[in-house]
């Protein structure tokens, strides 16, 4: 399987909420013998490899923000630690995996990475990641709502997040 990032760039006004999304593509095993570990972290855009550096999101590490669930389950972080920092990560049945950040500030701007580890018990392990950029803007040039830009270079149309 692979990880797709539907949007490569999110441009949001200060104070807004945003949900960053990754999506699992390809044959995703939903059987009982599969466990997924998923998490989010901040990084920097390296010359060779993005997402190699793992930095916290609002002081929460990728360990703090991780989800784990079986192939047939959905999951979300309901623990107080994440919510106290205005964060929640979630995963649904359809391969969508997201992190919601509330009350954005300029300090939230940067590169965000999702990491997925698929463990097929008695068989294998596979890990993949995706990256996207968040720009938080303030002042008269800031959009009134978050604007998202599709990852596909063919689709240059902007989509305003609901």
């Amino acid at each position: 399987f692979k990880v797709a990032t539907p949007y490569s760039l999110y441009v949001c006004p200060e104070g807004q909420n945003v949900t960053l999304t990754c999506r699992l593509l390809g044959p995703v095993d939903k059987g009982h013998d599969v466990t997924f570990y998923k998490t989010w972290y901040r990084s920097s855009r390296g010359e060779v490899q993005t997402c190699s550096e793992r930095r916290p999101i609002r002081n929460l590490t990728f360990q703090d923000l991780h989800l784990h669930h079986g192939g047939h389950q959905a999951a979300n972080t309901s623990h107080d630690l994440a919510q106290r920092h205005g964060l929640e990560s979630a995963s649904d049945h359809h391969g969508n995996f997201s992190i919601t950040m509330r009350n954005l500030t300029l300090l939230d701007s940067g590169l965000y990475c999702c990491l997925v580890v698929e463990i097929r018990h008695h068989h294998s392990e596979h890990r993949v990641h995706g990256a996207m950029e968040l720009q938080v803007q303030t002042g008269k040039d800031a959009p009134s709502n978050c604007v998202v830009y599709p990852s596909s270079s063919q689709d240059s149309e902007n989509i305003t997040a609901a």
Epitope: D33, T35, Y37, T39, G46, Q49, C51, S52, E53, R54, F62, Q63, H66, H68, L115, V117, I119, H121, H122, S124, E125, H126, R127, V128, H129
Partner: antibody
Amino acid sequence: QLQLQESGPGLVKPSETLSLTCIVSGGSISSSGYYWGWIRQPPGKGLEWIGSIFYSGNTHYNPSLKSRVTIPVDTSKNQFSLKLSSVTAADSAVYYCARRDILTGPFDYWGQGTLVTVSS
Amino acid sequence: DIQMTQSPSSLSASVGDRVTITCQASQDITNYLTWYQQKPGNAPKLLIYDASNLETGVPSRFSGSGSGTDFTFTINSLQPEDVATYFCQQYHNLPTFGGGTKVEIK
């Protein structure tokens, strides 16, 4: 501070089963974010991953050893084991137990290793 | 299985020299590669993960780089205490190790 300690016989006869135990202290083996594994190193040679067990009891084994390896876990004693059947002299090695963080990837904590010699 | 080919198998360098070790994967492993240091009689010690991230407490003279199939481990200024064998390991899939590089002082 997490510590892992291997124990078991230092001498095993050919064709018998090698049995080692790894006692984990300073952390719970039931933690969901970790694999607990065995790696071996023949004298003067490189490292070979043998297999790992997940907190739930599910396992991954090195395909080349799969038919001979079992890694049971005993969460009540906070320990896991290695059983390697039908041993030969080629199985003589220092055996390490180690922990792998699933999200980070590498083996981040290791036992000090125990030398097992296969000889009659 | 993903095969890891490490070279050289041994090297000898002077104190202060820059030492480079390479590791090649048989298929693309993104950046899911780690480097360990093993001193005689000891267990391996984690130095670098995700190809280039220095583990906490590891001296900054150690560094790693690379992506895909080709990776490099560098000791910027070799010190006497760096005499050891260094191993790479991939964790893109089930773990496999490189054959090791023994580093000695001239």
